[in-house]
Amino acid sequence: ISYDSPDYTDESCTFKISLRNFRSILSWELKNHSIVPTHYTLLYTIMSKPEDLKVVKNCANTTRSFCDLTDEWRSTHEAYVTVLEGFSGNTTLFSCSHNFWLAIDMSFEPPEFEIVGFTNHINVMVKFPSIVEEELQFDLSLVIEEQSEGIVKKHKPEIKGNMSGNFTYIIDKLIPNTNYCVSVYLEHSDEQAVIKSPLKCTLLPPGQESESAESAK
């Protein structure tokens, strides 16, 4: 199959592909809000092979407006064509298509994380899935941003091997009795726009000196 993909905005739906917890999630929105499908079927083909469309089994007759394609789309070197069909009963209300190059079009959602504040350091625990497919690593770097009193510091921890399992990073040399906020995100080598996590903040407990000063009062 060959293809031609200028930037048209008059398609009946818009698609977005995201790496969410290292799962490839395709989501869609209808531009015409007067169309109200009861269910959708998602199909795809690979541009490099003139094959017939394949129905995504777990996204056939689905009522959701997203689909997990992790087990279908394995290659970051392939271009994929998605076809979405929307139904009301047995009637096809619409069908629309989009071309995807995972390495270009994928947006990377931030991983889940927790923080625990100590007197002069913060433990940042980042949660990755226990197993992550090699092809879904995307040459990603984990970035941890530390913010305090208007100053932002970037930490790029070196992760040995795959981003899998839980990972703990210590932000040290911090000032006691100070409020710190932390955000994490995944950075791609191609300098795509990053999606930063919401900030998580903690007020570090006071150090020993201020503790003894407090008790002396």
């Epitope: 930037d7 048209y8 008059d10 398609e11 009946s12 169309i35 017939d52 096809t92 069908s95």
Partner: nanobody, 122 residues
Framework: QVQLQESGGGLVQPGGSLTLSCAAS????????MSWVRQAPGKGLEWVSA????????YYADSVKGRFTISRDNAKSTLYLQLNSLKTEDTAMYYC???????????????QAQGTQVTVSS
């Protein structure tokens, strides 16, 4: 009821050109991918080309790539297929279909599908 009326076929010499048209009615044309399939004498239906609802994306089978061009006019609810550099193996009945046709292709043909005959012969 979905109605698709193909036209523009004919007899043409190898290397020649034709433009097929498909007038659509009975559904909201602009909301649908459209495609062309063909059936050569004594053969099964074969997928040829598809175009996205807005016309921004076009797709072609390897056998016609670089020779055929699919397009659409949503204001006129009409689908087109420009056939250039025709070969004898392009001889077939050509049908347009609503949505992206896939096996069994016959499921995608309009109820009273007529098609338009293209014959490439010297």
């Amino acid at each position: 009821q979905v109605q698709l009326q193909e036209s523009g076929g004919g007899l043409v010499q190898p290397g020649g050109s034709l433009t097929l048209s498909c007038a659509a009615s009975g559904f909201t044309f602009r909301n649908h991918i459209m495609s062309w399939v063909r059936q050569a004498p004594g053969k099964g239906l074969e997928w040829v080309s598809a175009i996205s609802s807005g016309g921004g994306n076009t797709y072609y089978a390897d056998s016609v790539k670089g020779r055929f061009t699919i397009s659409r006019d949503n204001a006129k609810s009409t689908l087109y297929l420009q056939l250039n550099s025709l070969k004898t193996e392009d001889t077939a009945m050509y049908y347009c279909t609503k949505d992206w046709a896939r096996p069994p292709y016959s499921d995608f043909l309009a109820p009273q599908a007529q098609g338009t005959q293209v014959t490439v012969s010297s």
